[in-house]
């Protein structure tokens, strides 16, 4: 439905508070280096303009598209050329090319200082002094560091952030109340950002069809009682929402997400029995709750798929008439029967089925050709099952930190050209699969583990895309979205890699390591481990373990010493020499 003024339409639909918050997120995700105050000024100007359009939709410029209005506003920033370099060239383009240009310059790893959490009293004072500015600053800082964060979900995080401060700043022990809540929000926020980044990568790198296939599989697992037509409608609407958010159209995205939540709740009887509680919540909580809702129970009786998808005389006829609909039905029917499979496995099975039909429907005897298609699924199903079983056993044996170290070594040997910080970050996240998924019963392990690994490997892919250094990473990241994990799993030690020159500076440590948190100290040790493997890629597990044990003992000893700095200097030299000898450097 066309509106005379798009900006007035969205302002009225969303309300002033959400409108301002979403415009701030949009601007911060585009201009990630701009100071907070500059963004607030731009947002206020856009909001005042929107109000004039609400009052009179025929007023000057009110008929312009949101991209035109927002792009024009961003291009008024005086320091654009100095701060962003070639991104300033975007402003010479017309819409829609200008917006595409801004999107291409989004930086997944912006050069921004780490967010340091102030003292609780300082935060509470700031919160009480100016609640609005405090919450805007939260939106700004998250959005600029996570330029693909799902904007309507960030509003939900901000609401929880506000609730935490409202409650805890009045508590007797403010820190005990607030810090765990902030830790939880931080961890959930990182996970939410990474999940959304995969959705955007799926849309942008592999297209709408790939995203829709993912959505059919996931929604069919979640809503197995819903009919195919219902699932298809939800997939279409969900695709529109995520296309908008990934494209920077945050106002439309938030508006359409609210409409989708409304539709789901109005039609929950034909969608899922698990939605009742979600649908009683306010809008932001409702949308979040629906997105996380548990899988509904499967219908009591479902037939084998063989009749419709293998035995029927009409398989090739049905396929030829509407390929994507027929494959969509196959995926829907398979996924609703298998909540125990990962989405990516279901997509691999559907791809195998599609490939078989493409080949067989052109053969002399199609039925004879595709009769055993389900047998081809067996190795595809068993590969992730076996991998998860092996890795969960390893995790249970080693614990999270040592399991992460095993993955650090494994992945550094596979792709040693990747930067050390990226290898550490990705391997640490890969290692978290153990505590996240191995505790689950068998039926929940694969969807938990393999779909989580898809999210983490996408982080590697987007970070690597910014500065490509490894053909093997590029190949695994770009060839097939659903086969990324098997592609990385199949990589062996890179025999072409020329070991890095030994640099004693890399292994020089100081007393400041003693004051770091346990997590930070682990990262320091894991950084050293990656560097060791880069120097000596053929080092055995035993050799690396011996050096790491010596390193841990060295840190512990020097942190207990009276003169810590001298200890680190003297013992450090001995450790480097001993490590070189142990590894034959």
């Amino acid at each position: 439905d066309a509106h005379k003024s798009e900006v007035a339409h969205r302002f009225k639909d969303l309300g002033e508070e959400n409108f301002k918050a979403l415009v701030l997120i949009a601007f911060a995700q585009y201009l990630q280096q701009c100071p907070f105050e500059d963004h607030v000024k731009l947002v206020n100007e856009v909001t005042e303009f929107a109000k004039t359009c609400v009052a009179d939709e025929s007023a000057e410029n009110c008929d312009k598209s949101l991209h035109t209005l927002f792009g024009d506003k961003l291009c008024t920033v005086a320091t654009l050329r100095e701060t962003y370099g070639e991104m300033a060239d975007c402003c010479a383009k017309q819409e829609p090319e200008r917006n595409e240009c801004f999107l291409q310059h989004k930086d997944d790893n912006p050069n921004l200082p780490r967010l340091v959490r102030p003292e609780v009293d300082v935060m509470c004072t700031a919160f009480h002094d100016n609640e609005e500015t405090f919450l805007k600053k939260y939106l700004y800082e998250i959005a600029r560091r996570h330029p693909y964060f799902y904007a309507p979900e960030l509003l939900f995080f901000a609401k929880r952030y506000k609730a935490a401060f409202t409650e805890c700043c009045q508590a007797a022990d403010k820190a005990a109340c607030l810090l765990p809540k902030l830790d939880e929000l931080r961890d959930e926020g990182k996970a939410s950002s990474a999940k959304q980044r995969l959705k955007c990568a799926s849309l942008q790198k592999f297209g709408e069809r790939a995203f829709k296939a993912w959505a059919v599989a996931r929604l069919s697992q979640r809503f197995p009682k819903a009919e195919f037509a219902e699932v298809s409608k939800l997939v279409t609407d969900l695709t529109k929402v995520h296309t908008e958010c990934c494209h920077g159209d945050l106002l439309e995205c938030a508006d359409d997400r609210a409409d989708l939540a409304k539709y789901i709740c109005e039609n929950q009887d034909s969608i899922s029995s698990k939605l009742k509680e979600c649908c009683e919540k306010p809008l932001l909580e409702k949308s979040h709750c629906i997105a996380e809702v548990e899988n509904d129970e499967m219908p009591a009786d479902l037939p084998s798929l063989a009749a419709d998808f293998v035995e029927s005389k009409d398989v090739c006829k049905n396929y030829a008439e509407a390929k994507d609909v027929f494959l969509g039905m196959f995926l829907y029917e398979y996924a609703r029967r298998h909540p125990d499979y990962s989405v990516v496995l279901l997509l691999r099975l559907a791809k195998t089925y599609e490939t078989t039909l493409e080949k067989c429907c052109a053969a002399a005897d199609p039925h004879e050709c595709y009769a055993k298609v389900f047998d081809e699924f067996k190795p595809l199903v068993e590969e992730p099952q076996n991998l998860i079983k092996q890795n969960c056993e390893l995790f249970e044996q080693l614990g999270e930190y040592k399991f992460q170290n095993a993955l650090l070594v494994r992945y550094t040997k596979k792709v040693p050209q990747v930067s050390t910080p990226t290898l550490v970050e990705v391997s640490r996240n890969l290692g978290k699969v153990g505590s996240k998924c191995c505790k689950h019963p068998e039926a929940k392990r694969m969807p938990c583990a393999e779909d989580y690994l898809s999210v983490v490997l996408n982080q590697l892919c987007v970070l690597h895309e910014k500065t490509p250094v490894s053909d093997r990473v590029t190949k695994c990241c770009t060839e097939s979205l659903v086969n990324r994990r098997p592609c990385f799993s199949a990589l062996e030690v890179d025999e072409t890699y020329v070991p890095k020159e030994f640099n004693a500076e890399t292994f020089t440590f100081h007393a400041d390591i003693c004051t770091l948190s346990e997590k930070e100290r682990q990262i320091k040790k894991q950084t050293a481990l990656v560097e060791l493997v880069k120097h000596k890629p053929k080092a055995t597990k035993e050799q690396l373990k011996a050096v790491m044990d010596d390193f841990a003992a060295f840190v512990e000893k020097c942190c207990k010493a009276d003169d810590k700095e001298t200890c680190f200097a003297e013992e450090g030299k001995k450790l480097v020499a001993a490590s070189q000898a142990a590894l034959g450097l």
Epitope: D301, L302, A306, Y334, R337, F377, A443
Partner: nanobody, 123 residues
């Protein structure tokens, strides 16, 4: 501990009948699709027939259609395989299996397996 115990196997003349039973314990029987598989000497294990959780849907391999019938009694936690018009090529070790989730009835979807019961059809 989940246990599937098959019984009812034996030696029978071609054209004769047998009824196999599989008693399940240690699982919520009505939450599992059940299947019968067989393995003849020197051959791969093959699916014979499977039945959905509520018993409303069945799936038969072409080689046994019209001769074999699967049924289940959820109150008794038992699945049955009635085999009529038996042929020498039906000679095999017959396994009962349970699947929490099933789409194709293929072997890889089944979580639990019995030890098997031998059926020998002599000509």
């Amino acid at each position: 501990e989940v246990q599937l115990v098959e019984s009812g196997g034996g030696v029978v003349q071609a054209g004769g009948s047998l009824r196999l039973s599989c008693a399940a314990s240690g699982l919520t029987f009505s939450s599992y699709a059940m299947g019968w598989f067989r393995q003849a000497p020197g051959k791969e294990r093959e699916r014979v027939v499977s039945i959905s959780r509520g018993g409303g849907y069945t799936y038969y391999a072409d080689s046994v259609k019209g001769r074999f019938t699967i049924s289940r009694d959820n109150a008794e936690n038992t699945v049955y395989l009635q085999m009529n018009s038996l042929k020498p090529e039906d000679t095999a070790l017959y396994y009962c299996a349970a699947a929490r989730y099933w789409a194709t009835g293929s072997e890889y979807e089944f979580d639990y397996w019995g030890q098997g019961t031998l059926v020998k059809v002599s000509s």
